[in-house]
């Protein structure tokens, strides 16, 4: 089941999926001046069996000016511009992508890919949030959102990350700094 909406946006933070559930689709988008090759795939699809998951289809872009040149899918580091799903720069990765059954890794970039990736997530997908540069988390609690099915409708849980500007003092006045470990992931409301 596809999630109806995108993961929630929160102030001064970005989100990233560490792995993608089977059924996830990634649009084959090309950067300005390029287009999908004729009869090329509209999207990549995370598929698999009990032991292995991978992305079906290939995204291929060609120059809008020329009709015959095909650009193959080859990782181009210079093309990895900022996306909605840019790799988080957190020292601790919450999930090892390779170790999660029924999930695909982040697909490698394709030549002349658009700067923003558009994913279509499925129920059960989890995304992780971190504060953008210049902001820091108010505490170490849950910083994720999960797409859940509730009463026949899909919804994302609200991430509980609060990002505050660095202009604030590093020790907030009145802030307690307990030695507790982070709590579990946000849950949806109980059934009606």
């Amino acid at each position: 089941e596809l999630c109806d909406d995108d993961p929630p946006e929160i102030p001064h933070a970005t989100f990233k999926a560490m792995a993608y559930k089977e059924g996830t689709m990634l649009n084959c988008e090309c950067k300005r001046g390029f287009r999908r090759i004729k009869s090329g795939s509209l999207y990549m699809l995370c598929t698999g069996n009990s032991s292995h998951s991978s992305w079906d289809n290939q995204c291929q872009c060609t120059s809008s000016a020329t009709r015959n040149t095909t650009k193959q899918v080859t990782p181009q580091p210079e093309e990895q511009k900022e996306r909605k799903t840019t790799e988080m720069q957190s020292p601790m990765q919450p999930v090892d992508q390779a170790s999660l059954p029924g999930h695909c890794r982040e697909p490698p970039p394709w030549e002349n890919e658009a700067t923003e990736r558009i994913y279509h997530f499925v129920v059960g997908q989890m995304v992780y949030y971190q504060c953008v540069q210049g902001y820091r988390a108010l505490h170490r609690g849950p910083a994720e959102s999960v797409c859940k099915m509730t009463h026949g409708k899909t919804r994302w849980t609200q991430p509980q990350l609060i990002c505050t500007g660095e202009m604030e003092t590093s020790q907030f006045p009145g802030e307690e700094k307990p030695q507790a470990s982070p709590e579990g992931r946000p849950e949806s409301e109980t059934s009606c």
Epitope: P11, L138, I162, G174, P182, E183, T190
Partner: antibody, heavy 116, light 107 residues
Amino acid sequence: EVQLVQSGAEVKKPGESLKISCKGSGYSFSNYWIGWVRQMPGKGLEWMGIISPGDSTTKYSPSFQGQVTFSADKSTSTAYLQWSSLQASDTAMYYCVRGPYYLDYWGQGTLVTVSS
Amino acid sequence: DIQMTQSPSTLSASVGDRVTITCRASQSVSSWLAWYQQKPGKAPKLLIYKASSLESGVPSRFSGSGSGTEFTLTISSLQPDDFATYYCQQYSSYSWTFGQGTKVEIK
């Protein structure tokens, strides 16, 4: 159904202490921030601050820093707001809210009256 | 803290009227703004979040718009149940702050 249920109205004298409560149900209490909002008689809403019940991290609004204390007991899904020495100016309705950003669920409010 | 200013403070209107309330922020809050409705003796109720997203269960006659520093809450056709006080709240920069409120009363 998500609910925040607050303790009943209180009448106190200046200088007395007080602790009011807010019990959450219908969701994972530890995983959502709880905020507190004050509304003085006939006035607007004022943000007091926020607490994470999961690890008791707190952040007070500057106006309320040192005036009140937030606490939470995740085993009973209850958040608390307390005063060590009430003043007449603390007379107000106090709401607990589920945060952390827009406030989607509100308690019914606890009316605190401080009068000699 | 970011200051939020609502106008007007009081608004007299009739059932069926189109009503618009404005909220201005002292600095940009992007789209991180919510609107609440409060009736006498009751807790506030969330109407709109992220400037224009309608909270589940809220009638479609309520709508929000704006970004940056200027926002509006519109009631397309005022109903008897809509006479109340409305507040905006920014959640872009901690501490969160509310507008002073706009009371919508019967003309």
